[in-house]
């Protein structure tokens, strides 16, 4: 169930941003990577450093895929694994990191016009929590490559980032994924420190834009290793 998934996550503390929310000085509310919990004078984000169980790629983060942790391992035991970078071996598109796709068993860079969904894929959602449509009718969304003459705009349901238009990525929104803006310089980002680590991010962020990387904010260097705020910064 949802609660057992939540409780399986370890909590790490982040120091409160100076002058209110990061990037939003003086704000009365917090701005934070992924899903941030204000607790007392600390800010907390959920990060899970145990393997995150999954049944399909769509249950994992934008920089992960779902597979057995061992080669030829039990197919019934699958976890979210870190995506594979360019020139690494792959068996399917989802194994490759955002901006790449699987071609002839190797992760290669996606060209702007490439759309990975050559076959029709269906989003079906079944979670421990209830999720009903506001008008009371159930909804089943089928994504077909035929629909993708134009890529998904902001807010469109997606399977992976290549489904979204330029400047957008496919990120978790509750228990679906939608196209959201790629992070700009100075915006707070989520840094998963370990391979295979998975934050239960109900309101997930995109990755940093081109020429940017998610690094510790300079004025947070004094903080302990486990409590550092990360922002998108120039290489």
């Amino acid at each position: 169930t949802l609660n057992s998934v939540l409780n399986s996550n370890a909590i790490k503390n982040l120091p409160p941003p100076l002058g209110g929310a990061a990037g939003h000085p003086g704000s009365a509310v917090s701005a934070a990577p992924g899903i941030l919990y204000p607790g007392g004078n600390k800010y907390q984000t959920i990060d899970n450093y145990q393997p995150y169980p999954c049944a399909e790629d769509e249950e994992c983060g934008t920089d992960e895929y779902c597979a057995s942790p061992t080669r030829g391992g039990d197919a019934g035991v699958q976890i979210c694994l870190a995506c594979r970078k360019r020139r690494k071996r792959c068996m399917r598109h989802a194994m490759c990191c955002p901006g790449n796709y699987c071609k002839n068993g190797i992760c290669v860079s996606s060209d702007q016009n490439h759309f990975r969904g050559e076959i029709e894929e269906t989003i079906t959602e079944s979670f421990g929590n209830d999720h009903s449509t506001l008008d009371g009718y159930s909804r089943r969304t089928t994504l077909s490559s035929k629909m993708y003459h134009t890529k998904g705009q902001e807010g469109s349901v997606c399977l992976r980032s290549s489904d979204c238009a330029s400047g957008l990525c496919c990120a978790r929104h509750f228990w679906s994924k939608i196209c959201k803006p790629v992070l700009k310089e100075g915006q707070v980002c989520t840094k998963h420190r370990r391979k295979g680590s998975h934050g239960l991010e109900i309101f997930q962020r995109c990755y940093c834009g081109e020429g940017l990387s998610c690094r510790i904010q300079k004025d947070h260097h004094q903080a302990s290793n486990s409590s550092r705020l990360h922002t998108c910064q120039r290489h």
């Epitope: 929310a21 990061a22 990037g23 939003h24 704000s27 509310v29 917090s30 701005a31 934070a32 992924g34 899903i35 941030l36 209830d130 999720h131 009903s132 449509t133 506001l134 008008d135 909804r139 902001e154 807010g155 349901v157 929104h173 509750f174 679906s176 939608i178 959201k180 803006p181 992070l183 700009k184 915006q187 707070v188 109900i202 309101f203 962020r205 995109c206």
Partner: nanobody, 117 residues
Framework: EVQLVESGGGLVQAGGSLRLSCAAS????????MGWFRQAPGKEREFVAG????????YYADSVKGRFTISGDNAKNTVYLQMNSLKPEDTAVYFC??????????WGQGTQVTVSS
Amino acid sequence: EVQLVESGGGLVQAGGSLRLSCAASGRTFSSYGMGWFRQAPGKEREFVAGISWTLGRTYYADSVKGRFTISGDNAKNTVYLQMNSLKPEDTAVYFCASDESDAYNYWGQGTQVTVSS
């Protein structure tokens, strides 16, 4: 700047009802959706209910299904949590959060709900 303000908390007897409100002000970007979370003393924060303006869906934790109802008005930047058949285990500080299209996630300061047996 965006500010989220919760209200409606209080002390209520088991079996009673409360309606929480969360109002967002200062928004210059649209919101994808909003959610309610809670933290009981000595426990981890947990998701309670959510509403997605973008997808037209509502979401509930198993523990509140059938008792709590989330609703709202994106145009008015407001979300509500109607809590019926309250139980002592619902006692917690309730927070609302917003998934914003400017890539930041905003949190309110919380409102205390206490259910006596």
